[in-house]
Interface confidence: medium
């Protein structure tokens, strides 16, 4: 007997062909011998089956000896053996209908688990294999679980159900809710305006929730809430902001914060959390601020950085167009009795300059000028 696999909610067409290429009498019945549909002359007739309003044929092909049974909006319980009676012959087709659903929302927070559940007819023993958007394969039976979802798991998951050497394919769109970057670092000279951006890695029509930026300044003993805000249909409104520093926040996505001035006392690490409506858990993005200051006090030219720097970063002081006078993997470097000229303080990583501050050293009878 022929086996046909169908997908819940889809349409299936079961074929039945007569040897005579003309319209003759036919009937489709289920395994309980209940008539589903057939013909009476040129008219389609329907029986008392539960498929009544979802069953159809292809009237246009009857004249060619084709008498299909079309079942729309398939249900798991439509799985059955269907019998076509034509020309004193019986053609049997076994229909197996499967469904695959994500049994949580398809919008999941980074780090959460995804569970896919297969609905299958009694007596079937299907195997399921799913391929994630990043090419990872997972196999299972009635349920498949993926823990610790990552950003790269966003997209279309393709799942293949195998039964009787036949397959049916499901596609499920999964959206992993996360910020585009888990962490970012901003390098600024003292006094410069600081822009923090927190772009989301997903787009949804309506986005509602609330968020907060906690800040741990390097010089402070404890962290402090710098700003709290609400998000309603992608519109941002500030609820509370500290007086020092007085952050400003953009009214539209992506989430955008402005610190009027980079100062040593603000250097440190922040954690922006976003709690989305109807979701358990929060989105997180870490942000770091490194501040540089170059100063000349009497006969000492000093360059300092504050904030979370990696131990491999190099801090250097050099006279313009000359070799570095001093270069150390430390957070402060200095030169005693510096020559007159334009000095550069450089923070670099493997030769790539991350931050630069220039200071003009005047001959000893003058006071220094900071450009």
């Amino acid at each position: 007997k022929k086996v046909v696999l169908g997908k819940k909610g889809d349409t299936v067409e079961l074929t039945c062909t007569a040897s005579q290429k003309k319209s003759i009498q036919f009937h489709w019945k289920n395994s309980n011998q209940i008539k589903i549909l057939g013909n009476q002359g040129s008219f389609l007739t329907k029986g008392p089956s539960k498929l009544n309003d979802r069953a159809d044929s292809r009237r246009s092909l009857w004249d060619q000896g084709n008498f299909p049974l079309i079942i729309k909006n398939l249900k798991i319980e439509d799985s059955d053996t269907y019998i076509c009676e034509v020309e004193d012959q019986k053609e049997e087709v076994q229909l197996l209908v499967f469904g695959l659903t994500a049994n949580s929302d398809t919008h999941l927070l980074q780090g959460q688990s995804l569970t896919l559940t297969l609905e299958s007819p009694p007596g079937s023993s299907p195997s399921v294999q799913c391929r994630s958007p990043r090419g990872k394969n997972i196999q299972g039976g009635k349920t498949l679980s993926v823990s610790q979802l990552e950003l790269q798991d966003s997209g279309t998951w393709t799942c293949t159900v195998l039964q009787n050497q036949k397959k049916v394919e499901f596609k499920i769109d999964i959206v992993v809710l996360a910020f585009q970057k888990a962490s970012s670092i901003v390098y600024k000279k003292e006094g410069e305006q600081v822009e923090f951006s927190f772009p989301l890695a997903f787009t949804v029509e309506k986005l509602t929730g609330s968020g907060e930026l906690w800040w741990q300044a390097e010089r402070a003993s404890s962290s402090k809430s710098w700003i709290t805000f609400d998000l309603k249909n992608k519109e941002v409104s500030v609820k509370r902001v500290t007086q020092d520093p007085k952050l400003q926040m953009g009214k539209k996505l992506p989430l955008h914060l402005t610190l009027p001035q980079a100062l040593p006392q603000y250097a440190g690490s922040g954690n922006l959390t976003l709690a989305l409506e109807a979701k358990t858990g929060k989105l997180h993005q870490e942000v770091n601020l490194v501040v540089m200051r170059a100063t000349q006090l009497q006969k000492n030219l000093t360059c300092e950085v504050w904030g979370p720097t990696s131990p491999k970063l190099m801090l250097s002081l050099k006279l313009e167009n000359k070799e570095a006078k001093v270069s150390k993997r430390e957070k402060a470097v200095w030169v005693l009795n510096p020559e007159a000229g334009m000095w550069q303080c450089l923070l670099s990583d493997s030769g790539q300059v991350l931050l630069e501050s220039n200071i003009k050293v005047l001959p000893t009878w003058s006071t220094p000028v900071q450009p």
Partner: antibody
């Protein structure tokens, strides 16, 4: 929702053959039939034939008998329509459409322009 | 083959007008009649099947009626997006055949 994506435009010489593909996604490929319909420039719609889903049996309009071949590849969810012995009057946009039987063609490909010119 | 004849072949109407397009089959086709809308450079779109059943997602201003040989597509209040060409099609007997189309233009 079923999506049908067709191959790109073709330019052919009279007497040659053309093979147009129609790739299905978003549904169970083997569960529905595909009809092929063409439309000459500025003209109406003309049904060419249908390929049955599970068995791959076909039924063609008499006008195209012997010139049109419809095939399917279940592994790639693709249906093909090959038209041979092309003539200038075969210049048209060729569409594949999901055919739900007596409830009509409810999903169409974007169309493939075939130009037959010497 | 069953011939399908549509009338008129074109018509001019204004937004808000009630528009009626007719389709006649050369023999009885019961209710096996479908209506499609096609815009320039686009594939046809199913509007109505089995003479009077509205396809899901199609606005309720579209309606179909008829049985046997005479069928009608009605747009109760024409909207700017309705200016297009409309085709009827029979699914009673192969080869499936379409009407010649009715182009609905802005007056």
């Amino acid at each position: 929702q079923v999506q049908l994506v067709q191959s790109g435009a073709e330019v052919k010489k009279p007497g040659a053959s053309v093979k147009v593909s129609c790739k299905a996604s978003g549904g169970t490929f083997s569960s529905y039939a595909i009809s092929w319909v063409r439309q000459a420039p500025g003209q109406g719609l003309e049904w060419m034939g249908i390929i049955n889903p599970s068995g791959g049996s076909t039924s063609n309009a008499q006008k195209f008998q012997g010139r049109v071949t419809m095939t399917r590849d279940t592994s790639t969810s693709t249906v093909y329509m090959e038209l041979s012995s092309l003539r200038s009057e075969d210049t048209a946009v060729y569409y594949c459409a999901r055919d739900l039987g007596d409830t009509a063609m409810d999903g169409w490909g974007q169309g493939t322009l075939v130009t037959v010119s010497s | 083959d069953i011939q399908m004849t549509q009338s008129p072949s074109s018509l001019s109407a204004s937004v808000g007008d009630r528009v009626t397009i007719t389709c006649r089959a050369s023999q009885s086709i019961d209710s096996y009649l479908n209506w499609y809308q096609q815009k320039p450079g686009k594939a046809p779109k199913l509007l109505i099947y089995k003479a009077s059943t509205l396809e899901s997602g199609v606005p309720s201003r579209f309606s179909g009626s008829g049985s046997g040989t005479d069928f009608t597509l009605t747009i109760s209040s024409l909207q700017p997006e309705d200016f297009a060409t409309y085709y009827c099609q029979q699914s009673y007997s192969a080869p499936l055949t379409f009407g010649g189309g009715t182009k609905v233009e802005i007056k």
